[in-house]
């Protein structure tokens, strides 16, 4: 969480951002809130990115002002116009690119004063894993598959029964480049699987951590997956 304060002239206002991560090819949100104003026409929102000459986005007098918007963000940005009046300056970024990563500044002007806060935005790819039972040549294995990851993650297996066991010797992980030549499909196979046990496949890079759990019994197989973004720090 980054909380910024305005400096000069008029009173300063509090602006708060949250470091976040974008999933490439999907839409992302750059979060920013501020002390609201009673008149929409008095609010100016500017989003800037370190190292980029033009603006990322500008909203003033109740509407978008994109004449100074940088080419790399053309047609890809929007604020939540109906929420600006309540202090939401968050930016929606369409079709997140790897190159969108960096330091952004959310700069606010209202009748009460000015303020800004920086935001670290990471980009990559992350997806939920699915764990299934595979059966080949009379032996049961578990196959953990996740369609899109970048940068290349680590994959670790764990088991409820054999807590603390190292499964690296009895598992095999492969990374297959997807058609867009950036993200990769993750496939990890665990051998020597026993029934009446819960196994977890944990996939992690510096952006996200995902877990696929599978509980295997004779009568049923229970599966669940979780995805957690890392380093979501507020400023």
């Amino acid at each position: 969480l980054i909380i910024g304060f305005g400096i000069s002239g008029r009173h300063s206002i509090t602006v708060t951002t949250v470091a976040s991560a974008g999933n490439i090819g999907e839409d992302g949100i750059l979060s920013c809130t501020f002390e609201p104003d009673i008149k929409l026409s008095d609010i100016v929102i500017q989003w800037l990115k370190e190292g980029v000459l033009g603006l990322v986005h500008e909203f003033k007098e109740g509407k978008d002002e994109l004449s100074e918007q940088d080419e790399m963000f053309r047609g890809r940005t929007a604020v939540f116009a109906d929420q600006v009046i309540v202090g939401n300056a968050s930016l929606r970024l369409k079709n997140v690119q790897l190159t969108d990563a960096g330091t952004y500044k959310c700069y606010i002007i209202t009748s009460k004063g000015k303020g800004n806060a920086n935001l670290e935005y990471k980009t990559g790819a992350f997806s939920m894993p699915e764990v299934n039972v595979d059966y080949n040549a009379s032996s049961e294995t578990l196959r953990c598959e996740a369609p899109r990851w970048f940068p290349q993650p680590t994959v670790v297996w764990a088991s409820q029964v054999d807590q603390g066991a190292n499964f690296s010797e009895v598992s095999n992980t492969s990374f297959e480049l997807n058609s867009e030549n950036v993200t990769m499909k993750v496939v990890s196979v665990l051998y020597n699987v026993t029934i009446n046990n819960t196994y977890s496949c944990m996939i992690e890079n510096d952006i996200a951590k995902a877990t696929g759990d599978i509980k295997v019994t004779e009568s049923e197989i229970k599966r669940r997956s979780h995805l957690q973004l890392l380093n979501s720090k507020a400023s």
């Epitope: 299934n132 039972v133 595979d134 009568s219 049923e220 197989i221």
Partner: antibody, heavy 114, light 107 residues
């Protein structure tokens, strides 16, 4: 005795939604997942999804994802299946089944017709 | 999705006959296979789970066998109450899929 009692038959217009209930008794509701399966007239059985009543974690059949919503009310030990944007092909008998699909409800007939 | 193919789709048999229904999976599912019985207007009943384990209360004339991709449900001596439709179902991989069903009719 394990029992799953489902709500009565429904007739719906195309484009509308239907919500089917399944009241469980005779066992600890939160200890078993609940599955939903449908059967179109003269057809076989088709699995739609499953929900863990303890925390409402859901696995959907991708075929229905976006159209089906599974929920539970722990206070009444009732599971619900809501299907939206109904079309004529959704005319079927809808069943709830306790995981591991060992006990089934009696079925709810949903007819989609203009 | 895993395809489950049941055969025959229907059969005629007499009381006392030995009846065999087969189910084939499009890929290996180990032993994660259930067999169900369905009668018109009645709740579906689980007969066998994990290929060969008899569900509680199911008569011993029902048995299951197989592994991998090929499975069999056998009724050793058909009784009047056994005339119904039988389904296999795999639960190895999501989405769970059923066979097309086998209707057992009176000859």
């Amino acid at each position: 005795e394990v029992q799953l009692v489902q709500s009565g038959a429904e007739v719906k217009k195309p484009g509308s939604s239907v919500k089917v209930s399944c009241k469980a008794s005779g066992y600890t509701f939160t200890s078993y997942w609940m599955h939903w399966v449908r059967q179109a007239p003269g057809q076989g059985l088709e699995w739609m999804g499953e929900i863990d009543p303890s925390d409402s974690y859901i696995n959907y059949n991708q075929k229905f994802k976006g159209r089906v919503t599974l929920t539970v009310d722990k206070s009444t030990s009732t599971a619900y299946m809501e299907l939206s944007s109904l079309r004529s092909e959704d005319t079927a008998v809808y069943y709830c089944a306790r995981g591991p699909r060992d006990y089934w409800g009696q079925g709810t007939t949903v007819t989609v017709s203009s | 999705d895993i395809q489950m193919t049941q055969s025959p789709s229907s059969l005629s048999a007499s009381v006392g006959d030995r009846v065999t229904i087969t189910c084939s999976a499009s890929q290996g599912i180990s032993n994660y296979l259930n067999w169900y019985q369905q009668k018109p207007g009645k709740a579906v009943k689980l007969l066998i789970y994990y290929t060969s384990r008899l569900h509680s209360g199911v008569p011993s004339r029902f048995s299951g066998s197989g592994s991998g991709t090929d499975f069999t449900l056998t009724i050793s001596s058909l009784q009047p109450e056994d005339f119904a439709t039988y389904y296999c179902q795999q639960y190895s991989k999501l989405p769970y899929t059923f066979g097309g069903g086998t209707k057992v009719e009176i000859k």
